[in-house]
Interface confidence: medium
C-alpha cells in the first residue's frame, strides 16, 4: 500500500512527464539524429524507453542527464511519432509525441539568363530552378558573390525570376543562384554564368 501511495505522490509532485526532443527536427532520408529524453527530476535514477508508434526501440538508465538515443532516419515511416517513457520502480510517465519532418534536399539549380541590350543599358532577367527537392524552395540571386535579390519563395516547381537593369558594364560579371529549402545548413548553388563586359557579338545571352 505504501508503494502505491508513494507512486501517487511522485506522479503528482516529483514525477512529471518527460520531455522528448531533438536538435534536428527537419531531416533528409539517411540522416543521423540524436533524440534526447529528459526529466525535471535530477535526483532519481530513471529508466528511459524510446518508442516509435508502438514499437519499443531501446532503453537506457540515467540520473540527472538526458537519455540519448542515436538513430538514422532512412524511411518515411521512421519520421515518427516517437514517444519517451520515464520509469521509476512502478511509476511511469510518457512524453508528448515527437515527429521529424522529412525533406528531400534541393539539387543544384540551373541558372538561365536572358538579356535585352540597348545602347546604354542591359535589361537582365535571371531564372533559377531546382528540379528536385521538397517545396517550398527559396532562391537567392548573386552577382560577383554578393546577394542582389531577397529570398524568393516558390511553392511550385516553377523557376524564380529576378530582373535587373545595368549600365553597360566595363568588366565581366558573374551570376549564380542559390536554392534552399527547410533543411538546415543545406543549400546548393548553380554553376556560375559569366556576362562579358561589352555588348555586340560578345553577348551570347542578348536579344537584339
Amino acid at each position: 500500500r505504501k508503494a502505491v501511495l508513494d507512486c501517487e505522490a511522485m506522479k503528482t509532485n516529483e514525477f512529471p512527464s518527460p520531455c522528448l526532443d531533438s536538435k534536428t527536427k527537419v531531416v533528409m532520408k539517411g540522416q543521423n539524429v540524436s533524440m534526447f529524453c529528459s526529466h525535471k527530476n535530477k535526483s532519481l535514477q530513471i529508466t528511459y524507453s524510446l518508442f516509435r508508434r508502438k514499437t519499443h526501440l531501446g532503453t537506457q538508465d540515467g540520473k540527472g542527464e538526458p537519455a540519448i538515443f542515436n538513430l538514422s532516419i532512412t524511411e518515411a515511416h521512421e519520421s515518427g511519432p516517437y514517444k519517451c517513457k520515464a520509469q521509476v520502480t512502478s511509476c511511469s510517465k510518457y512524453s508528448r509525441d515527437f515527429s521529424f519532418t522529412i525533406v528531400d534536399p534541393v539539387t543544384s539549380p540551373v541558372l538561365n539568363i536572358m538579356v535585352i541590350q540597348t545602347e546604354t543599358d542591359r535589361h537582365i532577367t535571371l531564372h533559377c530552378l531546382s528540379v528536385n527537392g521538397s517545396l517550398p524552395i527559396n532562391y537567392t540571386f548573386f552577382e560577383n558573390h554578393v546577394a542582389i535579390s531577397p529570398a524568393i519563395s516558390k511553392y511550385d516547381r516553377e523557376p524564380a525570376e529576378f530582373n535587373l537593369t545595368k549600365k553597360n558594364p566595363g568588366e565581366e560579371e558573374e551570376y549564380r543562384c542559390e536554392a534552399k529549402n527547410r533543411l538546415p545548413n543545406y543549400a546548393t548553388y548553380s554553376h556560375p554564368v559569366t556576362m562579358p563586359s561589352t555588348g555586340g557579338d560578345s553577348c551570347p545571352f542578348c536579344l537584339k
Partner: antibody
C-alpha cells in the same frame, strides 16, 4: 544466431600498426553501439572505446590518439585501428555488442571470441 | 573517470557454498552496473545488468544487489561450473562522453 568474430591479430613490432576487424552476424550492426575491450595475459578487462549507431566515438583516456574505432554497416563489420604499438598493448582484443538498441549507455550482451595481439621485437 | 574496485581478488570455496563478491565504484553510478563470468580462454558472459536484473538463461542461484557505490554479486549455492573469474562493470554516459569501467576481477577456485 548472434555472432561476433574478430580477426587481424598477430605479431607486430613495437611502433607498428595493426587493424582488427569484428564481423557481426545474426543482427543489424546499424542498430547497436559496439565496443572494443582488451585483456592482457592474466590481467583485468580494459575498455578501449565505443562507437555509437551514428558513428560518434568514445575512447578511454589512454587510448585517445593511438586507437581508432570505425564501422562499415554495409559489411556488418567494426574495426579497431591501432598505431604506435607498444609491448604493453599485448593482449587479447574482444569486440562486444552493447545490449540496448541505439544507445551507448549499456552493458555487453554479446562478445567475440577475441584475437591475440603480440607486440614484440 | 570512474574506477571500480573488486574484492576479494580471489577466493576458494566448495560446491554448495554461498559466495559473495563485492564491487565498489569511486563515485555514485546509481544501478548502472553489470556482472560477467569469464572462464580461461573464453570471452566474458553477461550474468546481471542494472545491478540486480538476471540475464535471460542465467541460473537463479546468481543474484545482484546494491546501488550508488556499493554492489554485491551472490552465488547462493556454488556449482562445479561456477569456478571462474567474475568482473563487475559500470557504464556511464553524458551528452559529451560515454565510457565503461571494469573491476579487476575475482577468481573463484576450488577449496
Amino acid at each position: 544466431e548472434v555472432q561476433l568474430v574478430e580477426s587481424g591479430g598477430g605479431l607486430v613490432q613495437p611502433g607498428g600498426s595493426l587493424r582488427l576487424s569484428c564481423a557481426a552476424s545474426g543482427f543489424s550492426l546499424s542498430s547497436h553501439a559496439m565496443s572494443w575491450v582488451r585483456q592482457a595475459p592474466g590481467k583485468c578487462l580494459e575498455w578501449i572505446g565505443t562507437i555509437s549507431t551514428i558513428d560518434t566515438t568514445y575512447y578511454a583516456s589512454w587510448a585517445k590518439g593511438r586507437f581508432t574505432i570505425s564501422r562499415d554497416n554495409s559489411k556488418n563489420t567494426v574495426y579497431l585501428q591501432m598505431n604506435s604499438l607498444r609491448a604493453e598493448d599485448t593482449a587479447v582484443y574482444y569486440c562486444a555488442r552493447l545490449s540496448e538498441l541505439y544507445t551507448t549507455n549499456s552493458y555487453y550482451s554479446r562478445w567475440g571470441q577475441g584475437t591475440l595481439v603480440t607486440v614484440s621485437s | 573517470d570512474i574506477q571500480m574496485t573488486q574484492s576479494p581478488s580471489s577466493l576458494s570455496a566448495s560446491v554448495g557454498d554461498r559466495v559473495t563478491i563485492t564491487c565498489q565504484a569511486s563515485e555514485s553510478i546509481g544501478s548502472l552496473l553489470a556482472w560477467y563470468q569469464q572462464k580461461p580462454g573464453k570471452a566474458p558472459k553477461l550474468l546481471i545488468y542494472r545491478a540486480s536484473t538476471l540475464e535471460s538463461g542465467v541460473p537463479s542461484r546468481f543474484s545482484g544487489s546494491g546501488s550508488g557505490t556499493d554492489f554485491t554479486l551472490t552465488i547462493s549455492s556454488l556449482q562445479p561450473e561456477d569456478f571462474a573469474t567474475y568482473y563487475c562493470q559500470s557504464y556511464h554516459y553524458s551528452s559529451s562522453s560515454s565510457y565503461a569501467a571494469f573491476g579487476c576481477g575475482t577468481k573463484v577456485t576450488v577449496l
